[in-house]
């Protein structure tokens, strides 16, 4: 048919953290490179229907379905969704076609369906059907990765068994301690399954796909370093692998290591070691420990020795479950409105936790810091001096822990005030709770020095959106007082703080703030 | 149950010598190398010495020279021979078998 317009749909896929895309449907910003979706005429149907090739969306992704019309004049277009239909601004681009677009901010399972898109020309009426899903990311998995033995080699392969195939990195170190941060310049990263270098200060092997990424590190007793206080730990599963490496340097290959479980050699076969030259000419020796697959009886204390080291032990504990051990007691704490003061829980756990923070149906990210101890650490400091619930939530493959936090920030009350027709209410958030008087203020008392006692009653209540508590005073109104100021104030130990009402009849009431 | 005991802490002055022992119960003594550790006041505790199961003896910087660790496997217990003491000796000592601590002896040497 010749008088069929050129036409053309793309997604475009925008990054989550993109600004630039707008709540408007008409004029999105691109931020990646569009995907064609093709647009076939579709046969047998009535009328002139397109069909776009069937777009796959991660849930919280943002989208735009876009048409590009080549035809003569002006169009009018239509969308249509679940049978509503939605406004739709088209615009020319610069090369004068037709830009029909729909933008899909954070896929949910709501927006998924049948996107109709009908469009009138001078010549034509046409449909365009986009089908939009949510991936299934239930069948997505991203499991830590672990190490084997390459089959004649001395070399680690690093094996992720993931869902979609993640990409899988060395992330090797020569420095020590907070130098081996991961964006620190001291950190070498290699793309690849396979590792040779084996005698670097920190290995660890990261796999990661569409689920975030999953680190393993190579547990390394170094016999150069001072022992610690407290004994390395390491838990593992049944059925996992096991690998420890013993590392040693000496001004000459005149040394040996070797492992013992609890006084016992290891078994040939569950042990290989490697050593190699420095750059300034001394020896340094390896010697891995391993076992394809623990089982409760390889529980221990493993022990690397040397001839010219003082020996050093781990602690390896194979357990059947994975835990996360904390006190999950709810703590309250209360600071002054511009002290520095973090959050922190104190957790020991197998596998490791993806935690996050929450406030105020808020979700922030979650750090965690490994102590000398075999615990983990983790603060949370962004508070921005906000009281109220804070909650910490860790899970692992086995194991969820979740522990409440409140925060109350010491500040002089803050009054505000409403009335109605038969009563005068107070209300304040300061901290410690306010204490509350009521005074009149008439002709005896122009300095409102009257108190009221009769019909006063105060209450707490806690404001759930961040589980702080409000405190406030009601007054109910009677004879004697109708017709007069009344001063409300709410004080605590770090001040006063009052606002006036005028008690007249019904209608709108002026307050006075009073501070 | 593992038992460490340590004994012969006491008050010397600086250059005299003392000796350390520690007592263990509750472990396959000869087959375990023993570590001995110091904590001297607002300080973390630091390693000292250790003794391998096979005899060999490694020391810190500060006491090499200095000190001398010996063990007696049939009593089953480890000794520290520190000579040349200094003020900065001054510490709690204590002697580890793996993840088991003994109580600590206090030694004090006054200038």
């Known amino acids: 048919n010749q008088d069929l317009p050129v036409i053309k749909c793309v997604l475009i896929n925008h990054k989550n953290n993109d600004s630039s895309v707008g709540k408007s449907s008409s004029y999105p910003m691109v931020s990646e490179s569009p995907e064609d979706l093709g647009c076939a005429l579709r046969p047998q149907s009535s009328g002139t229907v397109y069909e776009a090739a069937a777009v796959e969306v991660d849930v919280s992704a943002s989208i735009t379905l876009q048409v590009l019309v080549d035809a003569p004049g002006n169009i009018s277009c239509l969308w249509v969704f679940k049978h509503s239909s939605l406004n739709c601004q088209p615009h020319f681009d610069l090369q004068n076609r037709g830009v029909v677009s729909m933008v899909i901010l954070k896929m949910t399972e709501t927006q998924a369906g049948e996107y109709l898109l009908f469009i009138q020309s001078e010549a034509t009426n046409y449909t365009i059907l986009f089908t939009v899903s949510i991936r299934n990311t239930l069948l997505y998995t991203l499991r830590r990765p672990y190490f084997r033995k390459m089959e004649n080699q001395d070399a680690l392969v690093c094996i992720s068994e993931s869902v979609p195939e993640p990409i899988v990195e060395w992330v090797l170190c020569d420095s020590q301690g907070e130098s081996c941060k991961e964006e620190s310049p001291a950190v070498v990263k290699k793309e690849e399954k396979v590792l040779h270098e084996l005698f670097g200060t920190d290995i660890r092997c990261c796999a990661r796909n569409e689920l975030g990424r999953e680190c393993t590190r190579l547990f390394t007793i170094d016999l150069n370093q001072t022992p610690q206080t407290t004994l390395p730990q390491l838990f593992l599963k049944v059925g996992e692998p096991l690998w420890i490496r013993c590392k040693a340097v000496h001004v000459n290959h005149g040394f040996g290591l070797t492992w013992e479980l609890e006084n016992k050699a290891l078994e040939e076969g569950n042990y290989f070691e490697m050593s190699t030259y420095s750059t300034n000419r001394t020896m340094i020796r390896i010697l891995f420990a391993f076992v394809s697959s623990v089982a409760r009886n390889d529980t221990g204390y493993y022990t690397c020795s040397s001839s010219k080291h003082p020996s050093q032990s781990a602690l390896v504990t194979i357990v059947e479950k994975g835990f996360i051990n904390a006190t999950n007691s709810s703590e309250d704490y209360e600071i002054d409105q511009y002290e520095e003061f973090c959050f922190s829980v104190r957790f020991k756990a197998y596998p490791q936790i993806r935690c996050t923070w929450t406030f105020s149906r808020k979700s922030f990210p979650c750090e965690q810091k490994g102590l000398d101890n075999g615990y983990s650490i983790s603060k949370f400091c962004n508070h921005k001096h906000q009281p109220g619930e804070y909650i910490f939530h860790a899970e692992n493959d086995d194991a969820q822990f979740t522990k409440m936090f409140t925060l109350n920030i010491r500040r002089k009350p803050q009054v505000l005030a409403e009335a109605s027709a038969s009563q005068a209410s107070c209300f304040s958030d300061g901290y410690p709770l306010p204490s509350w008087t009521w005074k009149k203020c008439s002709d005896k008392s122009p300095n409102c020095t009257e108190e009221i006692t009769e019909g006063v009653w105060n209450r707490k209540a806690n404001r759930k959106v961040f589980g702080q508590w409000v405190s406030s005073s009601t007054l109910n109104m009677s004879e004697a007082i109708k017709g007069f100021l009344v001063k409300c104030c709410a004080y605590n130990s770090l001040g006063t703080s009052c606002e006036t009402i005028l008690l007249n009849s019904p209608g709108p009431f002026p307050f006075i703030q009073d501070n | 149950q593992v038992q460490l005991q340590e004994s012969g802490g006491g008050l010397v002055q600086a250059g005299d010598s003392l000796r350390l022992s520690c007592a263990a119960s509750?472990?396959?003594?000869?087959?375990?190398?023993i570590d001995w550790y110091r904590q001297a006041p607002g300080n973390e505790r630091e390693w000292v010495a250790q003794?391998?199961?096979?005899?060999?003896?490694f020391y810190a910087d500060s006491v090499k020279g200095r000190f001398a660790i010996s063990r007696d496997n049939a009593k089953n217990t480890v000794y520290l021979q520190m000579n040349s003491l200094k003020p900065e000796d001054t510490a709690v000592y204590y002697c580890?078998?793996?993840?088991?601590w003994g109580q600590g002896t206090q030694v004090t040497v006054s200038s």
């Open positions: 509750g472990v396959t003594f000869s087959a375990s190398y």
């Open positions: 003794i391998t199961r096979g005899g060999d003896s």
């Open positions: 580890r078998v793996l993840s088991y």
